[in-house]
Interface confidence: medium
Amino acid sequence: WELTILHTNDVHSRLEQTSEDSSKCVNASRCMGGVARLFTKVQQIRRAEPNVLLLDAGDQYQGTIWFTVYKGAEVAHFMNALRYDAMALGNHEFDNGVEGLIEPLLKEAKFPILSANIKAKGPLASQISGLYLPYKVLPVGDEVVGIVGYTSKETPFLSNPGTNLVFEDEITALQPEVDKLKTLNVNKIIALGHSGFETDKLIAQKVRGVDVVVGGHSNTFLYTGNPPSKEVPAGKYPFIVTSDDGRKVPVVQAYAFGKYLGYLKIEFDERGNVISSHGNPILLNSSIPEDPSIKADINKWRIKLDNYSTQELGKTIVYLDGSSQSCRFRECNMGNLICDAMINNNLRHADEMFWNHVSMCILNGGGIRSPIDERNNGTITWENLAAVLPFGGTFDLVQLKGSTLKKAFEHSVHRYGQSTGEFLQVGGIHVVYDLSRKPGDRVVKLDVLCTKCRVPSYDPLKMDEIYKVILPNFLANGGDGFQMIKDELLRHDSGDQDINVVSTYISKMKVIYPAVEGRIKFS
């Protein structure tokens, strides 16, 4: 019996087609992805093959103005239109709290939404009961297939699930659910989830009875043969893991942003054992036409976005200095604003000992591309912010050793004065530079805001201490020469869309007046 698994993950609000790098589509003839094009390919395969499942491994939420405006309603609407068979919850599905998941998505989806390792407690338990499931048995042709879901156990530190959801260890939580499916005589089981490629492989190895793992979270690109675009494969597709009980378990993921449609063909014997598996992600390029009915629907939903772009998010009563003459040379108040927004977006009360789990932000001055003039009635719009942060990046959470941070600040001024982008803007950090000293030895003072304290105050950076820091994904990936961050980071979790973080903060504050306040000094 043959099953075709079509899968997506980490689509992150890319409902419209995008450029090859998943940013805003500029030249339509070279654009990729988008739900209209995805639908064309899915329908083509559904017509050609008998047993097809369309699955999503989480993180549909967060990434473009579509999510900012529609808050998940767009996800439910277009996933329903594409007739997805199941979805696993990703960490970003909790970005607007549990309510922001329940109302727009869980209540509106016509397909099962899954996670076996999220357990609701307290008053939420009855409210959310039945809206998401640990597993679902789906009829496919003459057979049944069990889909069991999982979500990153780190979600409480990456998003806003609140205190009434417990995120258990994936493997511990999955095994009893798979065992339950076996007792129900379901002998073909797919683990669908959002914990990253390493956890996907562990699940394949350790969870008895899982036949296939379809994952997300790590944006992993797998491919057999010559890859069709810029992504470099992390391994072959499918990636085969030998389980502890000796089975060959295919593990797949389909990069991110709707650029590819994962395509996996599995052959099962009559006892539900995988006999063979093969396939590849399909690049959704312009050779695949956009479905006209879905495209028309997209255009209808787009109107509200265009209106939103020019609406006032909040006001500034001061000039927001995002000029390169300031932000690449000294502390600038636009940098302070963005860093304050980044920290605010990551407020997660950890326990009674910590006021927050993270207090620090760094931001390359070169990533700030425009000022905002307060003389336009103080109005700040999404359009204004898109000029400041045009690259469509994310603000991510990393863990770094103090010594790595010190190296980063030395790099910040190693060729000071040449208007280069690596000059760091900061939040929760006080740094003093002495430019008369030789490069690599210019940081004379580096104090950081405590997290394990009831009254936050600045203490000297400890070289051997481990710190959490919010920064642009560009820096986490070693951009602007910050190789030491990429090489030495101890953990990296991707975060929210940069513009969205700042726009949410401005909307929340209503009126802003960021100052230059001595975060960066020169002795």
Epitope: E198, L202, A234, D351, H357, D464, K486, D487, E488, L489
Partner: antibody, heavy 120, light 111 residues
Framework: QVQLQQPGTELVNPGASVKLSCKAS????????MHWVKQRPGQGLEWIGN????????HYNEKFNNKATLTVDKSSSTAYMQLSSLTSEDSAVFYC?????????????WGTGTTVTVSS | DIVLTQSPASLAVSLGQRAIISCKAS??????????MHWYQQKPGQQPKLLIY???NLEAGIPTRFSGSGSRTDFTLNIHPVEEDDAATYYC?????????FGGGTKLEIK
């Protein structure tokens, strides 16, 4: 089956250097940090340092800064630790170890250990 | 460096009874609400084996006779009921701050 294979013994002269190997199999070598741990006869465990095989990034216990150098060979999925200027204090079992997740710093998989004896 | 002090250095427990091993850290090993303390078992001539990670999570395949608890600076490994096979040296380990450090070990003997 995730495995870390280490040679059983190394006999070296005082003042010399030795390069210990740890061959990984059963998983994507570049996806997990590799750690090294020292255990002197009848003593406890000491963390030496770790290396990120995907890009060579390292962290050392300062105590071993001028003693140990960690490297990897991605093509053979092998991690190496070079120990220099050996003395009797360096006679010990040296383990390589790996965590369950890319960024977990507890060790679920251990090599069998290489016993280094420094003696003339 | 964070110093981990294990006590007792050795203990003898009768079959079926409870063994309690303590590990005290010189400073808190909690990080944003998570205790970064782990426990290993080592038998003579063998490599260490992970029992419990992040204070209380049982590693896959480890019997439920083993349990961990504690927070901040004080942590405990419990074994109950003790079996013959549990004779070994037990180590705690922290990864709150570089360098990662281990406790001095507790040798468990079965009476």
């Amino acid at each position: 089956q995730v495995q870390l294979q280490q040679p059983g013994t190394e006999l070296v002269n005082p003042g010399a250097s030795v390069k210990l190997s740890c061959k990984a199999s059963g998983y994507t070598f570049t996806s997990y940090w590799m750690h090294w741990v020292k255990q002197r006869p009848g003593q406890g465990l000491e963390w030496i340092g770790n290396i990120n095989p995907s890009n060579g990034g390292t962290h050392y216990n300062e105590k071993f800064n001028n003693k140990a150098t960690l490297t990897v060979d991605k093509s053979s999925s092998t991690a190496y630790m070079q120990l220099s200027s050996l003395t009797s204090e360096d006679s010990a079992v040296f383990y390589c170890a790996r965590g369950d997740y890319a960024y977990d710093w507890y060790f679920t998989v251990w090599g069998t250990g290489t016993t280094v004896t420094v003696s003339s | 460096d964070i110093v981990l002090t294990q006590s007792p250095a050795s203990l003898a427990v009768s079959l079926g009874q409870r063994a309690i091993i303590s590990c005290k850290a010189s400073q808190s090993v909690s990080f944003a609400g998570t205790g970064l303390m782990h426990w290993y078992q080592q038998k003579p001539g063998q490599q260490p084996k992970l029992l419990i990670y992040r204070v209380s999570n049982l590693e896959a395949g480890i019997p439920t006779r083993f349990s961990g608890s504690g927070s901040r600076t004080d942590f405990t490994l419990n074994i109950h009921p003790v079996e013959e096979d549990d004779a070994a040296t037990y180590y705690c380990q922290q990864n709150r701050e570089f360098p990662w450090t281990f406790g001095g070990g507790t040798k468990l003997e079965i009476k």
